[in-house]
């Protein structure tokens, strides 16, 4: 498929654009804003004459140079100045500030906990399948298959540490070679970047906020994908990671050490352990080919057990497998030996919610997945609103300057490297790159952190998670020390190589440009963000895995033409941008292709049609949910009762504004329930602009 023109700045005059999103319409006076035609992002639309030659090419609002959506927004302070407040007002303001800070910490805590529960939910839903991916050893010797298995497993269990520990166990028990494990580690690195991309989806309410948040999250994805694109073939050809890590291990003598401190787990575990506790050894056992593990539940039932070691007669294949010649005998058919068998005696049950439910893993997983996503979404909305209310005026200026300003010349280049160190340090503290990058996503969305600054922080996070893995490897038992350390080092040097590829030279910071391009597309067509997520993290890896099952010839037969087509499109795209004159007239743009092949507009129409159809059919069922949501968000949504009517009729009806009764406005409902027609809700002194519906 040809590249989307949305990524091009093909317009000769950036001030002329279709249905202006910003710029010309900014002159509309306030009083007219209520009546002016608006697009679905709530911005007024100015109809502009369009040159026919650009009609099929420029399908996205190209903002004028003066108003770049990637510029960090000015967080205006509309409140009363400190000096203008009386004593009572000042005390109230202090208490408000403390209250907001406590609320922020509370929501942040819930946010991190919900990420933990989300990971558990994913493991319950797809953990066993993930384990089975690993148990297919023959496929994993193929590096491409290994890569996609790494992606799929990490996406399924939402934890790169789980997939890494499985790989370590498999290498330690010689089920997998280090060479075969390296592509899987690369895949796990990609898979772990899905979490913050999911978190970014929660910010789809406001187009510009979503643009920034999604780009900020996907910069991680692009870094990982691009690194793999270069480093996987390099590793397959030279085995440099394997050789380098071998050299490191031979040069330095590593002793068992302390594991990294679990600072965040100490805080979150008391809460998350009340919700669910998993026996992660089950996934590992499935991966190791234990057929019995397939029937075990991942849900931990017994938390306190006593292990009794008893001597048991067991059969062995031959006398060589006996514990010792003294403990070896035969019954004439089989050879027997004495083995110490550990029998578990259950003492006390775990204290989580699902301990006494005899629900299957899948059911518990789906329940937890739904609940954790709702909490994640809710927390994110609240964090964004709280931050939006706190980060105004001076505070915002200070924070933005601190985070986004470079060192003075000639040390400006050092700023990014300091950000990498900060990202690594913060990740090391919280022991999870997912938590760090997910927490950073809303900050990028609201404009506190720029994409340019988020990029090195994300790269640092990638390094931080590998240093954690190295420490964990050093704390592992003697029999797995070498393999776990080598894998952790492979992971570390892979990320270092990636940084060397895509960071030091500004020109090579391709992930930023690609993420911004994707951010632009997703801001206009928000469904594309979901499509991107499903396509790159599920469909593509599954397809490649399926083709790998069929064997190398099939994989090459299907893969090579696709790769050649992509390369052809990229070459053509570069020629169109750099030197279109050498191309025939027909190939200077993508108009020679059907519209659906070079624009998302037709696809958008189909999806809009499908969703409106879905709304019409399913709305009645959703009426109860709608009312509950309205009760939670505090506005009695008049549309809930009318949702079974035809949408055509509904569009004719006027929105009846209902005053919000003290809750935050709900992102998904805000268009329907605007506070006094202005779309603003003031709670704890916060003015939070209402957002449009998510999709």
């Amino acid at each position: 498929m040809a590249p989307w023109p949305e990524l091009e700045n093909a317009h000769p005059n950036p001030n002329k654009f279709i249905e202006g999103a910003s710029g010309p319409q900014s002159s509309i006076p306030d009083k007219d804003k209520g009546t002016s035609k608006t697009n679905d992002s709530g911005t007024p639309v100015a109809k502009i004459e369009l040159l026919p030659s650009y009609s099929a090419l420029v399908l996205i609002e190209e903002p004028p140079e003066g108003n770049d959506p990637w510029d960090l927004p000015e967080l205006q302070d509309n409140g009363i100045k400190w000096s203008e407040r009386d004593s009572k007002g000042k005390i109230l303001c202090i208490f408000q500030g403390i209250g907001k800070f406590i609320l922020l910490l509370g929501f942040l805590y819930l946010f991190v906990c919900s990420l933990d529960v989300l990971s558990s939910a994913f493991q319950l839903v797809g953990g066993k399948m993930a384990g089975q991916f690993f148990s297919n050893n023959s496929i994993m010797s193929n590096p491409v298959a290994g890569l996609v298995i790494g992606v799929l497993v990490t996406v399924m269990v939402q934890s790169s540490s789980t997939s890494s520990s499985i790989i370590v166990s498999m290498v330690a028990s010689s089920l997998l070679s280090v060479r075969a494990a390296i592509p899987i580690i690369m895949g796990a690195n990609i898979g772990t970047s899905i979490t913050n991309t999911i978190v970014a989806l929660m910010q789809a309410g406001d187009r510009n906020e979503f643009r920034r948040a999604f780009a900020g999250a996907t910069v991680h994805d692009f870094f990982n994908w691009l690194s793999v694109l270069v480093l996987l073939p390099l590793e397959a050809a030279t085995h440099y990671l394997e050789k380098l890590t071998n050299l490191v291990l031979e040069t330095f003598s590593f002793q068992n050490g302390e594991d990294a401190p679990d600072i965040l787990k100490v805080i979150t575990d008391p809460f998350t352990k009340l919700i669910i506790q998993l026996d992660k050894k089950v996934i590992q056992q499935i991966a190791m080919g234990d057929s019995e593990a397939q029937n075990k539940s991942l849900i931990k039932i017994w938390c306190k057990t006593i292990s009794n070691v008893i001597e048991e007669n067991v059969t062995v294949p031959s006398p060589d497998n006996c514990t010792s010649p003294s403990y070896c005998w035969t019954d004439g058919i089989q050879t027997w030996t004495i083995q110490n068998v550990t029998e578990k005696e259950n003492i006390a049950k775990c204290q989580h919610i699902f301990v006494n439910f005899s629900l299957p893993d899948l059911a518990v997983g789906i329940i937890l997945l739904t609940v954790s996503l709702l909490i994640l979404c809710g927390c994110l909305i609240m964090i964004v609103k709280l931050l939006g209310s706190v980060l105004r005026g001076q505070v915002a200026t200070v924070i933005k300057k601190t985070l986004n300003t470079d060192f003075p010349f000639p040390f400006a280049w050092l700023t990014g490297y300091l950000a990498i160190l900060v990202g690594a340090g913060m990740t090391f503290i919280v022991q999870s790159s997912s938590v760090f990058t997910s927490a950073m996503t809303p900050l990028i969305g609201i404009g506190v952190i720029s994409i340019e600054r988020a990029y090195p922080l994300t790269l640092g996070s990638n390094i931080g998670t590998t240093t954690t893995a190295i420490l964990a490897a050093l704390a592992s038992p003697g029999n797995t020390l070498r393999s776990s350390l080598q894998i952790a080092l492979c992971h570390f040097f892979f990320n270092i190589s990636g940084i060397l590829l895509w960071y030091p030279i500004p020109f090579t910071r391709l992930p930023i440009r690609l993420a911004k391009g994707l951010g632009n597309i997703s801001a206009k067509y928000r469904w594309f963000a979901v499509f991107y997520l499903i396509f790159f993290f599920l469909l593509t890896p599954l397809t490649v895995f399926g083709l790998s099952l069929a064997g190398w010839p099939v994989l090459v037969g299907v893969g090579v033409p696709i790769i050649l087509l992509i390369l052809l499109v990229l070459c053509l795209r570069m020629l169109q941008a750099r030197c279109p004159r050498i191309l025939p007239l027909k190939l200077r743009d993508w108009n020679f292709l059907p519209l659906w092949m070079h624009s998302l507009k037709p696809w958008d129409n189909i999806i809009s049609l499908a969703t409106s159809c879905f709304q019409r059919r399913c709305c009645c069922c959703c009426r109860v949910c709608c009312r509950v949501c309205c009760m939670v968000c505090g506005c009695k949504c008049c549309r809930c009762s009318k949702c079974c009517k035809n949408l055509e009729e509904e569009e004719k009806e006027q929105d009846v504004p209902v005053k919000a009764s003290g809750g935050f406005d709900n992102t998904a409902m805000s268009k329907e329930c605007q506070d006094e027609g202005k779309g603003q809700v003031e709670v704890l002194g916060m003015k939070a602009l209402s957002n449009t519906t998510v999709f």
Epitope: N313, P319, S324, P325, S326, Y327, C328, W329, T330, D331, G332, I333, Q334, T335, W336
Partner: antibody
Amino acid sequence: QVQLVQSGAEVVKPGASVKMSCKTSGYTFITYNMHWVRQAPGQGLEWIGAIYPGSGDTSYNQKFKGRVTLTADKSTSTAYMELSSLRSEDTAVYYCSISTIITTGAVDYWGQGTLVTVSS
Amino acid sequence: DIQMTQSPSSLSASVGDRVTITCKASQDVGTAVAWYQQKPGKVPKLLIYWTSTRHTGVPSRFSGSGSGTDFTLTISSLQPEDVATYYCQQYSRIPLTFGGGTKVEIK
């Protein structure tokens, strides 16, 4: 009580084969390994092999491998031993025996024996 | 194969005497040794297994000891009915092997 009743004495020519039976009663046939031991006149005991009637798994003394076949018929609770390519030194009393001491090769019940005489 | 060497090949003792028969294995067999008694014209009878465990119905005057490669069968007080040939057997490895036998007679 456990009983192992073996077939009668056989006189066979060198190079021929002999198939003897061991009919069991008083226990569950498929539970215990059935061993075959021989004793040449005035000599010691020599283990030939064993069969687990439950699965049909067999184990043979390398000395007899290729010449001996152990089988078991679960329907009649009878074990069989066939010895081929007989030589004069195969003249012996052949015993079937079982070990009810689970997991050991110590045999505690014996058949009365089948005398096989190899003579031209 | 593991060789089991029994000694003596025959012995003569008086009623009431303490009789000791030894058996030496060519390699470590742990404690996987059994002792059998075979009276003239009869089938062998299991006396002891696991080196020292007496089989059901075996008189207490019979005892076994040893481990590894050296094993002993002891008849604490020889009785006229104990006249027989005694065999040791290892069941540590396949094939199971027997000793050459010790013939016990009464003086």
